[in-house]
């Protein structure tokens, strides 16, 4: 058993049929010695008396809020949560496996630039009685500070018969130099509590590997005289690291109709303009990627050919 | 010719071309190592990230773009005193401390060149003959060093009398390649910045 936060404790259980469970001793936080009784959750049934209560925790019915009272007055609470371990593996029931970029990916993180600011998100089908808390650091043995905000519900989607909820959190490395060469990864730890179930999820990454620039901005078209070619120009996204001559981007320019199966024109360039062939009912799209370290491409920025 | 000087013509800065070749060659070699050594811990997640130039050179700091010198997090790292020392102090803001920066890059290349050559000599003794260093990568390191055109003491190639542990050597190769790729990215960024200055 360990303390998650004040008056909240996590009991780690090997989860298999007829498992013996864990013996837990709860102590009432009071100077009083006599006349103390214990109850669980909303029940008025007295579980025991005395300053300490010894219980055998085997299942979720044994978890919950234990309260010690004296003469009708509440003295203190202890909330017991369960963390299940099945076949030596901690349970991952609360969050959905996003399977990208690989299986068992529960947390996904992205950074728009090298400032040390990043966003992580996760998915769940659970809609109520759910709380998250996020901690992060650079390195684990001698951790350097990363500050994370509160996790918030950022999107709701319908997937077949199920509703899916996306939560996200923003974090900022306390003292980040955009030009630094990372040798210690960022560690992100998410504590998830659903009712009386506790789970924890972690992710470890270098900012350089989670870079995904915003799409290029200000796409403009200029038809070329006596030609089907069009000059398309754009600018670096505002959120990208500066100076741009140091943090350079490379671009992919594509002309395509509405369907992915349609024919297309595609060209790669390090410049902020390119010449392509425009077709009726097609769109010109441009996306960006770090020129020197191939992490993710940005989403497309698009303008219609017409 | 002593130091490459940034001029308006992008083709006039030879180091830019060489640094782009360097990054491509290292990335290519790293990809090859990851494929060939698929049963060794050779991915970014699996290896320890070591920097053989740590406390010996200061490329990131010496080559900081002017725009980032206002960022205290970029200056309070290991070599601040080195940055503001010596004859470059007066021209710090205007010259991007080019000489110090390029000499630091040169020293990086020299250290990696020695490590890679030593390692290749060991790998050539491996009866499995599983992986060798790409001669193109070694040539590109050499070309960039020549373009930088610094004179410095030659570092003797390390020779080891004991029987090489090929497993350890291959893991060390992965560690070196990962670190060198990160440094090659920095070098490419620096050359691009200098070329645009």
């Amino acid at each position: 058993i360990w303390e998650l936060k004040k008056d909240v404790y996590v009991v780690e259980l090997d989860w298999y049929p007829d498992a013996p469970g864990e013996m837990v001793v709860l102590t009432c936080d009071t100077p009083e010695e006599d006349g103390i009784t214990w109850t669980l959750d909303q029940s008025s049934e007295v579980l025991g008396s005395g300053k300490t209560l010894t219980i055998q925790v085997k299942e979720f019915g044994d978890a919950g809020q234990y309260t010690c009272h004296k003469g009708g007055e509440v003295l203190s609470h202890s909330l017991l949560l369960l963390h299940k371990k099945e076949d030596g593996i901690w349970s991952t029931d609360i969050l959905k496996d996003q399977k990208e970029p690989k299986n068992k990916t529960f947390l996904r993180c992205e950074a728009k630039n090298y400032s040390g600011r990043f966003t992580c998100w996760w998915l769940t089908t659970i809609s109520t009685d759910l709380t998250f808390s996020v901690k992060s650091s650079r390195g684990s043995s001698d951790p350097q500070g990363v500050t994370c905000g509160a996790a918030t519900l950022s999107a709701e989607r319908v997937r077949g018969d199920n509703k899916e909820y996306e939560y996200s959190v923003e974090c900022q490395e306390d003292s980040a130099c955009p030009a630094a060469e990372e040798s210690l990864p960022i560690e992100v730890m998410v504590d998830a509590v659903h009712k009386l179930k506790y789970e924890n999820y972690t992710s470890s990454f270098f900012i350089r590997d989670i870079i995904k620039p915003d799409p290029p901005k200000n796409l403009q078209l200029k038809p070329l005289k006596n030609s089907r070619q069009v000059e398309v120009s754009w600018e670096y996204p505002d959120t990208w690291s500066t100076p741009h001559s140091y943090f350079s981007l490379t671009f992919c320019v594509q002309v395509q109709g509405k369907s992915k199966r349609e024919k297309k024109d595609r060209v790669f360039t390090d410049k902020t303009s390119a010449t392509v062939i425009c077709r009726k009912n097609a769109s010109i799209s441009v996306r960006a990627q770090d020129r020197y370290y191939s992490s993710s491409w940005s989403e497309w920025a698009s303008v219609p050919c017409s | 010719r002593n130091l490459p000087v940034a001029t308006p013509d992008p083709g006039m800065f030879p180091c830019l071309h060489h640094s782009q070749n360097l990054l491509r060659a290292v990335s290519n070699m790293l990809q090859k190592a990851r494929q060939t050594l698929e049963f060794y811990p050779c991915t970014s997640e699996e290896i320890d990230h070591e920097d053989i130039t740590k406390d010996k050179t200061s490329t990131v700091e010496a080559c900081l773009p002017l725009e980032l010198t206002k960022n205290e997090s970029c200056l309070n790292s290991r070599e601040t005193s080195f940055i503001t020392n010596g004859s470059c102090l007066a021209s710090r803001k205007t010259s991007f401390m080019m000489a110090l920066c390029l000499s630091s890059i040169y020293e990086d290349l020299k250290m990696y060149q020695v490590e890679f050559k030593t390692m290749n000599a060991k790998l050539l003794m491996d009866p499995k003959r599983q992986i060798f260093l790409d001669q193109n990568m070694l040539a590109v390191i050499d070309e960039l060093m020549q373009a930088l055109n610094f004179n410095s003491e030659t570092v003797p190639q390390k020779s080891s009398l004991e029987e090489p542990d090929f497993y350890k050597t291959k893991i060390k190769l992965c560690i070196l390649l990962h670190a060198f790729r990160i440094r090659a990215v920095t070098i490419d960024r620096v050359m691009s910045y200098l070329n645009a200055s």
Partner: antibody, heavy 118, light 107 residues
């Protein structure tokens, strides 16, 4: 299977015109761009131009402008290359090539040899 | 027009050898470079697109590399069926242009 089948070899006199064909099968003809590429004896490849069969849009390499005309007939899934004012230096194998992407060539015809000789 | 220069114009090699062909553009073309193989009397065949992207059905011994102005095609362990002529082609701008070709011959 995506295939391009070209018409047979042609022998022409200088000053004449020749029209060679390229029949597409295994895909929707208007879904791919169609290009023509020339290869003179013992020489390299030269791109001549392309057509978008969907709308008839064409683009020619400057060196072939006025010399060649590229057309397409969607009713027969066939592309055509017409060469006018033939000279001995037009003796070459002419390939049609197609792709969903405009700028490179995924599928090739077998080639048509055009010989210009008096 | 962008000029594409291939070297060497021919190379003699044995089965099992590693062969590298280079292609240089007269100006930067990013990764807009494609490689083709042509056997005598046959049409060219696409091997690599956009400098390094593999084509399905093409053996993995063929690999492409480069960006900007310098590119290379490597055949890792030469097979009897690889003796042919190889061409690079730029798609950075029209007109599309090819290199002069490199003939890989049996030593």
């Amino acid at each position: 299977e995506v295939q391009l089948v070209q018409s047979g070899a042609e022998v022409k006199k200088p000053g004449a015109t020749v029209k060679i064909s390229c029949k597409a099968s295994g895909y929707t003809f208007s879904d791919y761009y169609l290009h023509w590429v020339r290869q003179r004896p013992e020489k390299g490849l030269e791109w001549m131009g392309w057509i978008d069969p969907e709308n008839g849009d064409t683009e020619y390499a400057p060196k072939f402008q006025g010399k060649v005309t590229i057309t397409a007939d969607t009713s027969t899934d066939t592309g055509y290359l017409e060469l006018s004012s033939l000279r001995s230096e037009d003796t070459a194998v002419y390939y049609c090539a197609a792709n969903k992407e405009l700028r490179y060539f995924d599928v090739w015809g077998q080639g048509t040899l055009v010989t210009v000789s008096s | 027009d962008i000029q594409m220069t291939q070297s060497p114009s021919s190379v003699s090699a044995s089965v099992g050898d590693r062969v590298t062909i280079t292609c240089r553009a007269s100006q930067s073309i990013s990764i807009n470079l494609h490689w083709y193989q042509q056997k005598p009397g046959k049409a060219p065949k696409l091997l690599i697109k956009f400098a390094s992207q593999s084509i399905s059905g093409v053996p993995s011994r063929f690999s492409g590399y480069g960006s900007g102005t310098d590119f290379s095609l490597t055949i890792n362990s030469l097979q009897p069926e690889d003796f042919a002529r190889y061409y690079c082609q730029q798609s950075n701008s029209f007109p599309l242009t090819f290199g002069g070709g490199t003939k890989v011959e049996i030593k």
